[in-house]
């Protein structure tokens, strides 16, 4: 098992850009400061499943 | 199916104390946040409070700040919304929703994709 | 906290239509905006994210852009469906914040 992340609670904080290192099924909510469940997209068209990239369009799609 | 359930609205006096419950089914809260957003009659939406069931963070709007606890419990998978020193202008459809995230360059793209049908709190003598 | 400033409050409109609402934040949010639909005793629901990206089942005459401070929906030829009122919120930095809401009604 891999080291635990440390989980700092800093509510309101302007500091949002720097994201925590998160786990594979994990990405950072700037909204709550913590990282949180992330869904993958999948292309309708071809079924691809990835990260989100800004200018395509994409389907949201349960992550595993 | 993603479904959330709200309960425990009704007329309270002013002073009094509500619990609403948000129920949720067909994914589990403890690692999305949940969210508490109100309308009172005739207005727009306003954000109360969320949750992130994981690790306990919470945060209020200033209106409610010091009256409202949010809660969750992960083994009933149910948030909760402990409403005390309740004012008339608290009067609202109160709902509850969950904040979905997409994984963008490992941050959220997000919104509240799910919620619930709402529940009328009235504070009234 | 950010506010989020949206306009007009309430627009008249047509079938066919081209329809864009505008919202202004206080400060930067980067592309931290949702987009809502409303309509009367029913709960919001979600149209855009990310301020440009279309959420599933979601119309593809509804479109979202913009990133900093100012955004905007745009609904490309509005149907009958489409008369409700809609929100802009912010989830860049806690809390959250709607916009003041758009209605938009039959000409």
């Known amino acids: 098992m891999g080291a635990r992340r440390l989980r700092v609670r800093s509510q309101r904080s302007r500091d949002s850009s720097v994201p925590t290192q998160c786990n594979q099924t994990e990405c950072f909510d700037p909204l709550v400061r913590n990282c949180v469940s992330c869904e993958l997209f999948h292309t309708p068209d071809t079924g691809h499943t990835s990260s989100l990239e800004p200018g395509t369009a994409l389907q949201p799609q349960e992550g595993s | 199916e993603v479904q959330l359930v709200e309960s425990g609205g009704g007329l309270v006096q002013p002073g009094g104390s509500l619990r609403l419950s948000c129920a949720a089914s067909?994914?589990?809260?403890?690692?999305?946040?949940i969210h508490w957003v109100r309308q009172a009659p005739g207005k727009g939406l306003e954000w109360v409070a969320w949750?992130?069931?994981?690790?306990?963070?919470?945060d209020y709007a200033d209106s409610v700040k010091g009256r409202f606890t949010i809660s969750a419990d992960t083994s009933k998978n149910t948030a909760y919304l402990q409403m005390n020193s309740l004012r008339a202008e608290d009067t609202a459809v109160y709902y509850c929703?969950?904040?979905?995230?997409?994984?963008?360059?490992?941050?959220?793209?997000?919104?509240?994709?799910?919620w619930g049908q709402g529940t009328l709190v009235t504070v009234s003598s | 906290d950010i506010q989020m400033t949206q306009s007009p409050s309430s627009l008249s409109a047509s079938v066919g239509d081209r329809v864009t609402i505008t919202c202004r934040a206080s400060?930067?949010?980067?592309?931290?905006v949702a987009w809502y639909q409303q309509k009367p005793g029913k709960a919001p629901k979600l149209l855009i994210f990310?301020?440009?990206f279309l959420y599933s089942g979601v119309p593809s005459r509804f479109s979202g852009s913009g990133s900093g401070t100012d955004f905007t929906l745009t609904i490309s030829s509005l149907q009958p469906e489409d008369f409700a009122t809609y929100y802009c919120?912010?989830?860049?930095?806690?809390?959250?914040?709607f916009g003041q809401g758009t209605k938009v009604e039959i000409k």
């Open positions: 929703a969950r904040r979905v995230c997409y994984n963008r360059l490992g941050v959220c793209a997000g919104g509240m994709d799910y």
């Open positions: 067909g994914f589990t809260i403890a690692s999305s946040s």
């Open positions: 949750v992130l069931p994981s690790v306990g963070f919470t």
């Open positions: 400060e930067d949010i980067s592309s931290a």
């Open positions: 990310a301020a440009s």
């Open positions: 919120q912010q989830s860049q930095i806690s809390p959250p914040t």
